[in-house]
Interface confidence: low
Amino acid sequence: QPDAINAPVTCCYNFTNRKISVQRLASYRRITSSKCPKEAVIFKTIVAKEICADPKQKWVQDSMDHLDKQTQTPKT
């Protein structure tokens, strides 16, 4: 069941084919639910758009690394 009361489980069914510039990214979440077909990363852009990405791709790992190193802690 969801971990929060009435919280939906967010899943990614397809990944973006395009590399996204880190300057456009605000934050990320790493989705690991067994209720989802794929392990995924959801990037949130500076204009609040959410994009599904493949955590096995190097640009995705580099982008997460970049966001980790930022001192601020934006809420997704």
Partner: antibody, heavy 115, light 111 residues
Framework: SLEESGGDLVKPGASLTLTCTAS??????ICWVRQAPGKGLEWIAC????????TYYASWAKGRFTVSKTSSTTVTLQMTSLTAADTATYFC????????????WGPGTLVTVSS | ALVMTQTPSSVSAAVGGTVTINCQAS???????MAWYQQKPGQPPKLLIY???SLASGVPSHFRGSGSGTQFTLTISDLESDDAATYYC????????????FGGGTEVVVK
């Protein structure tokens, strides 16, 4: 639900393998956390859900501890060169919908290292 | 390493009272990935709060999590005898070096 097994009394320098069994056919990420008697919690390692089986270890656990997925419902923790400092209750825990917290824990299994 | 400093180590309060537990991270916790767990003797920990302030399923609403960055707080109001337990904070930091850090624990005694 989750259940650990394999805890035992072993001598220093010995090896031991613990098993975590999940009741469902699939699970989220499974992590191992230990707790020495009367002490706090200490993260050891995690293994990814799905077919990728990505593994993540605490820096102190690398090399001596190995986490593996042995079936669709079981995850093991292999421990080598055990010392008295490894005496603890070992818990397996399932992550939530994100990787960052543990929403379900097993009851734990006790490992005692003593000569 | 991600080090979580939890205070106080022990606190006592009366039924109906309020307890506040603080947790300070050695580095900023990304996306406020802070959780709080309750543990009773002989039992495994139980998730109370995740992502700093989200209440886990089945957890009573008198538990409240707050904070961001490096400073986080668990507040237990309208204290009940069943709340007597040890509470742990736990932070998660970074993709490149996945790491969980647990606080040292706070024992809550209900009078």
């Amino acid at each position: 639900s989750l259940e650990e097994s394999g805890g035992d009394l072993v001598k220093p320098g010995a090896s031991l393998t613990l098993t975590c069994t999940a009741s469902e056919l699939d699970f989220y990420w499974i992590c191992w956390v230990r707790q020495a008697p009367g002490k706090g919690l200490e993260w050891i390692a995690c293994i990814g859900a799905g077919s990728s089986g990505s593994t993540y270890y605490a820096s102190w656990a690398k090399g001596r501890f190995t986490v593996s997925k042995t079936s669709s419902t079981t995850v093991t923790l292999q421990m080598t060169s055990l010392t008295a400092a490894d005496t603890a209750t070992y818990f397996c825990a399932r992550t939530g919908t994100e990787f960052t917290y543990y929403s379900l824990w097993g009851p734990g299994t006790l490992v005692t290292v003593s000569s | 390493a991600l080090v979580m400093t939890q205070t106080p180590s022990s606190v006592s309060a009366a039924v109906g009272g309020t307890v506040t537990i603080n947790c300070q991270a050695s580095q900023s916790v990304y996306n406020n990935n802070m959780a709080w767990y309750q543990q009773k003797p002989g039992q495994p920990p139980k998730l109370l709060i995740y992502t700093a302030s989200s209440l886990a399923s089945g957890v009573p609403s008198h538990f409240r999590g707050s904070g961001s960055g490096t400073q986080f707080t668990l507040t237990i109001s309208d204290l009940e005898s069943d709340d007597a337990a040890t509470y742990y904070c736990a932070g998660y930091k970074s993709y490149s070096n996945d790491e969980y850090g647990f606080g040292g624990g706070t024992e809550v005694v209900v009078k």
